[in-house]
Every structure is written in C-alpha cells, then in structure tokens.
C-alpha cells in the first residue's frame, strides 16, 4: 500500500522508532562559583524527552561580590519578585556592613500562598516572554531554540533567597515579582504538578561557610539540604553528575565534563517533565511530508491524526493559527503558527507581548476541543545557550560585576563565571488514551490544523497558567 | 471504485487563463495529498502542484509559482488548479493524481485534460 | 535536462529480464528519499508500479521489482510479456528544487 510510502533521510520505519511517543522534559540548573563562573545547562534527553539543565558556578575572586545559587530550571520562568522567605542576617561576618540582607524566613499561610498562585503565574508568562525575546536576539536567525522559564526561575528564585539589597531587587525585575514577594517560594513549590518533578541540590567546597539561615530555608522550601564536596575534582565531578542522572530518570547522565579544582559552590536544579499526549497518535500515519522551511520545501516526519481533539482559532493580532493539543498531566502543548506562508514567524515573534499572549491563553480556556485534521510534525528541539548573555541582555549584571548574596554565604568574594542552559525537547506519538475513533463525529465543515511551516510552541500549565517549556521551531529535522 | 475525473481543458491564448477541476469518488478525499501533474506532447512527467490534506499549505514547481494556484474542496471532493498568464510552454495534458505521502508516491491518476496555449 | 537521468530507451524479448536505472544526485536519491516508479501504456494516464524503492501496490505483478542503492535506482522486469511495452518513469523528492522530480522516461520496446 502507497500509504506506507515515506520519501525522505530517514524512512518511515525507522522513524516510527525513535521514540515512546512522550513528551518529557528535564531540566537542570547548574551554579558553579569557582572564578566568575555561573552554569546553566540542560542536557539532551533520549527520545520522547525533554531535558533541561542549568548549572551555575561560581568561584572566588578577588572582588567582594556573590553570585547567585540558583539554577534555572527549563520551565516557564519568573519575572522578578522576592523570594517567599527571607533569609536571617544574622551572621557576624556580613560582607557590608549596614546593607540589607534577606531575615529569617517566614513561612505562608495556604490562604496567602493560593493568592500568590495567580501573581506568580502571572509573572512567570511576563518572565517567560522576555526570556523569549532574549533568546530569540541571542540566536541565529532562523533556527531553532527550545528553553525552560521554569527552570530559570527556578535557579533565579532560590538565588533571591540568598540576594540583598540592589541584586535581590534587580532579581525581582527580572522574574517580573511585585517587590517584598515573600511567598513566591512557597508557591513555586506549589506549581509543581505530577507531570513534573523539580529538584534542587547544592554542592559546596569544605572551606565554604554556608549560613544556617540559607540551609534552613533550602531544606524547607527546595527540600534539599547543601551537600559537601571534597578536595577531589574527580569525585565532586562523579558525586554531581550521579545526582543529576538520578534526578533526571537518567536522562541527562553527564551534566559536567569537568570541575574548576576551586569551585567552591555549585548549585544544581532539575525538573524532569514526563508527559504524554492525551490521544495517542498512530505512528503508522506519521509520513515523511513536506515543511516549508527558510526559502524551500523539506521533507520532515508528520504526525497526522483525522479527528484530533484540537483547540484552535484565528489570532488577528498575531496573524497566527493558535492551537492547543491536551497532554496528561494537565498539561497541553500550544502551537502558534502564522496564518499562511506571507506571514513570518520573526513577525508574529515580534508582535507577541505578554498581553496578546495572555489574552491568547484566555480564549484559548474559553475554546472547546473538537476533532481537528491534524498535521503535525515530530519536535526535537536541543538548544544550548549561555545564560549570561541572556541576563544581560535582561539588563542584569550582578553576576559579573555587583553580586550581593550576603543571605547565602558569609564569604564576600564570590563571583558567577559561567551560566549555561541547555534544553532538549522531543514530542513523540505516543500518548495515555488511544484516540476515540467512535466517540467522535466530524463535524460537516472540516477543521483543519495543519503546521507546515516554522512555528512557536508553548508547554503550558493548565492548572497554574504558566509556561513550563517554551520555545520556536524552523526546521523539524535539526 | 476509486477514480479521478479532470475537466477544464482548452484552447486559449497566450497571456489567457484556464481552471481546471478534478472530481473525486470513491475515497475518503481528505485523506490525501493531492496534486497536478503535466505531460507536455512527446516529453515525459512533470510535477506542477500539490496541496495538503486540509489544503492551508501549497506547493508549486518554480515555473508555474505567482501563475497557478492549486486549490481544494473537501466538502466537494474536488481539486482545482487556476492558471493564469498562460504561456506555449504550459500546453500540455494535465493530470490529477491522489497522493497517500507527501508530495512523492501518485498512486491513483485521472485521464488527463488537454491544455493548449496558442494563437 | 531531467534532474533523474534514464536511459531512453530499452528493449528485451519475451520471458527475457530487462533492467531500468535511474540516475540521481545527493539531492534526491542519495540524500535517502524513497524512489517510485510508474508505467505508462501508450495513450494512457501513469500508473504506480513501484512505491517506497521496492513496494509493489497491489495488483502489480511480481515480475516486477525495485531496488535502490547509493544514489541510484533500478527497476527490473522479469519474464518479460508484450504488455510490457510503455514508459517507464523514475521519481522522486529532490532538496534543491523543493518537489518532486521525475525521470526523463525510458520506453521500453519488447521484440
């Protein structure tokens, strides 16, 4: 049968096998403070996962600055706000005198937490734009990119639990946080749904003074106490990488090639997102079919379903197709593609600020899911991108050169040299049901949502609506 | 029993324009890919356009782009193929073909209509 | 010039095996897109004989078959039969010209 037919690099059989069909996501935030050093990176994942890693080092300097201990997760992040606790100041060697430094953290009711459910979401989508825009400007033109807010937030939160005075305020800019918003920890754990797991962990050197008060609020909010490393590079190197890996589901097994022999903290958040699609797709009708890419036409392997439950309208804003696609979890994958080929994506891009995108979601909870001829290609997005680049095209430089982190160390020469986030994205066939061939009646004019062209893609929170992963697609081979 | 009907073919002149139709039966129409291919008199095949399932995406081989318009009518079953500023070249006969893929294997072909361009 | 090179002619005589090549580049064939192949009697519409480089739709004789290696392809007939006489075509997706392209044809004579 011609159906089988499947033209292309790679053939459809083979391409029926390179994934479960999932789409799982972990990220991981790496802080390394050894020489100005702050590392964020996700890493690869296997088929039909996402990954996303952010490391942060840091290492002593001369200069009396910290650096932040936080490593993003690659999940919609935050704008700035203040972390849910503050941190006591109570230590004798503050590093300046007569300067703030975060107090004693201070636990919120459930009442106040539920209320910052909906700030913190909000700032989360505002972070995650921005965060858009600014990978978007670091990038080539053209090409793929994949990232995690989350995550980010994630790394930059737990910082601002340690940060005082201009770095903690500047932090919250950033996250998009009201000022003094001392429940966003608190919350952040709370955004936490069984499709994903968030796990942060730091590692710090023997001669490194970590304030009780910082421990205290790590245990409690990031369940995770500061883990010792040795003097030996080798084993810190295997003792991070064992934690990441198990932390991942394996997914992300080598984290770090190396270890600066001074590092002196390393601060590691992971969110791992296993989640697949509410109906499966049939990997016998996912075809070698043609994708309009740059100037041409490629050929790229397309998931086709003929009644797939699909949200979808026209954004006249956007001039873009929206369309939402149900993951377990409660989760779904929004898609953003423009409305035909004269329409770019770097336009659509452009014009997608945090109210259109908010008032896209709105309709979107408004709009039912019916059965849609669907088109879709398979996603494998794997970006990797120096995050302090992305902070300063943010306009935050505390990392390099004012960083205040007074709540989190009594040492004052601590400087972030390095942040690195990496992301893998993988979208599959498989999904938690099989599709309803029965129970579903076409409707007499065909809905049509075919993606055959460079698209935007969103991996939403439907509980707390915020953006977990986010990021664009031009070539669904690369 | 599956089959593809073309209709539409003609004389006309240099510069004129031409619609072509292509009826459907015996499949489910939207399952497909569909496309246009011609056979100019004693030369082999050419692919000239194709369309999507849904018919929002379109393709075209670069002699005919800004010229002819492939387009698609699920609830009819039926492809058209618009073709305008016509030139000598473009005489040729014009058949409909399914195709299950994506732009590659044409497993079912209508008879043809013939295009002539002259003066 | 057709991007898929065919020899344009061949012939056989009955019960004989005759063979078709198809020439490519790295930008259709050899950049691994599958290879078709079609039949087209005198005065009739093509018809699909091979799909997928080596897939015979139904219907199609065995005496027919595909194979592809590198950047070309072939098709062979064997138990050659007077019916056989037509064109033979050669397609498939080409990278630089965004479609799919088809073979000059090779008519194929049965002695």
């Known amino acids: 049968n011609p159906n089988a037919t499947s033209s292309s690099s790679q053939d459809p059989e083979s391409l029926q096998d390179r994934g479960e069909g999932k789409v799982a996501t972990t990220v991981i935030s790496k802080m390394l403070f050894v020489e100005p050093i702050l590392e964020v990176s996700s890493l690869p994942t296997t088929n039909s996962t996402t990954n996303s890693a952010t490391k942060i080092t840091a290492n002593t300097t001369d200069e009396p600055t910290t650096q932040p201990t936080t490593e993003p997760t690659t999940q919609p992040t935050i704008q700035p706000t203040q972390p849910t606790t503050q941190l006591p100041t109570d230590s004798p060697t503050q590093p300046t005198t007569g300067s703030f430094c975060p107090g004693p953290v201070t636990l919120c009711s459930d009442l106040e937490s539920h209320s910052t459910e909906a700030v913190l979401g909000d700032a989360l989508v505002d972070f995650s734009l921005k965060l858009y825009h600014a990978f978007s400007a670091m990038k080539k033109v053209e090409t793929n990119m994949a990232f995690s807010p989350f995550s980010i937030a994630s790394l930059l939160t737990q910082v601002l639990l340690g940060a005082g005075e201009n770095t903690k305020t500047n932090l919250e800019s950033i996250l998009s946080y009201p000022k003094d918003f001392t429940c966003v920890h608190q919350a952040l754990k709370g955004f936490t749904t069984k499709g994903v797991t968030s796990v942060s962990q730091i590692f710090h050197s023997p001669d490194l003074a970590i304030r009780d008060t910082f421990v205290n609020a790590s245990r409690t909010l990031y369940s995770s106490s500061p883990r010792v490393l040795s003097n030996n590079s080798d084993a810190n190197l295997e003792l991070i990488n064992t934690w990441v890996a198990k932390n991942t589901n394996n997914k992300i097994s080598r984290l770090l090639d190396s270890l600066p022999s001074d590092t002196r903290l390393v601060l590691l958040n992971a969110i791992y997102l296993s989640a697949k699609w509410k109906t499966t797709f049939d990997p016998k009708k996912t075809r070698m079919e043609p994708f309009h890419f740059k100037n041409s036409v490629i050929k790229v392997p397309m998931m086709n379903s003929k009644k797939y439950p699909v949200a979808h309208f026209i954004d006249q804003t956007l001039k873009a197709k929206v369309g939402q696609l149900q993951l377990s979890h409660n989760l779904s994958l929004v898609i953003l593609v423009p409305q035909n080929l004269k329409h770019r994506l770097e336009d659509m891009e452009q014009a997608l600020s945090p109210s259109v995108f908010k008032a896209i979601m709105e309709k979107l909870e408004m709009s039912k899911f019916q059965p849609t001829l669907l088109t879709l290609p398979r996603i494998k997005v794997t970006t990797s991108q120096d995050m302090l680049s992305i902070m300063e095209k943010l306009e935050f430089f505390d990392f390099s050169y004012d960083l205040n982190l007074c709540g989190l160390t009594e040492d004052p020469d601590l400087q972030v040299s390095a942040m690195q986030h990496q992301t893998v994205l993988e979208l599959t066939e498989t999904g938690v049901e099989a599709a309803a061939a029965s129970a579903i009646s076409v409707a007499r004019t065909l809905l049509v949502f075919e993606v055959q062209q460079p698209f935007l893609f969103v991996l939403w929170d439907q509980q707390h609506k915020f953006p977990v992963f986010m990021g664009r697609v031009y070539d669904p081979r690369a | 029993e599956v089959q593809l009907l073309e209709s539409g073919g003609g004389l006309v002149q240099p510069g004129g324009s031409l619609r072509l139709s292509c009826a459907a039966s015996?499949?489910?129409?939207?399952?497909?890919?569909m496309s246009w291919i011609r056979q100019a008199p004693g030369k082999g095949l050419e692919w000239v356009s194709g369309?999507?399932?849904?018919?929002?995406?379109?393709f075209y081989v670069d002699s005919v782009k800004g010229r002819f318009t492939i387009s698609r009518d699920n609830s009819k079953n039926t492809l058209y193929l618009q073709m305008n500023s016509l030139r000598a070249e473009d005489t040729a006969v014009y058949y409909c073909?399914?195709?299950?893929?994506?732009?590659?294997?044409?497993?079912?072909w209508g008879q043809g209509t013939l295009v002539t361009v002259s003066s | 010039q057709s991007v898929l090179t065919q020899p344009p002619s061949a012939s056989g005589t009955p019960g004989q095996r005759v063979t078709i090549s198809c020439t490519g580049s790295?930008?259709?064939?050899?950049?691994?897109?599958?290879v078709q192949w079609y039949q087209q009697l005198p005065g009739t519409a093509p018809k699909l004989l091979i799909y997928?480089?080596?897939n015979r739709p139904s219907g199609v004789p065995d005496r027919f078959s595909g194979s592809k290696s590198g950047t070309s392809a072939s098709l062979a007939i064997s138990g050659l039969r007077s019916e056989d006489e037509a064109d033979y075509y050669c397609?498939?997706?080409?990278?630089?010209?965004?479609?799919?392209?088809f073979g000059g044809g090779t008519k194929l004579t049965v002695l």
């Open positions: 073909a399914r195709d299950p893929g994506g732009l590659d294997a044409f497993d079912i």
């Open positions: 015996g499949f489910t129409f939207s399952d497909y890919y």
């Open positions: 369309i999507s399932r849904g018919g929002e995406y379109t």
């Open positions: 790295s930008s259709n064939i050899g950049a691994r897109y599958d």
């Open positions: 997928g480089n080596s």
């Open positions: 397609a498939s997706w080409d990278d630089s010209l965004s479609g799919p392209v």
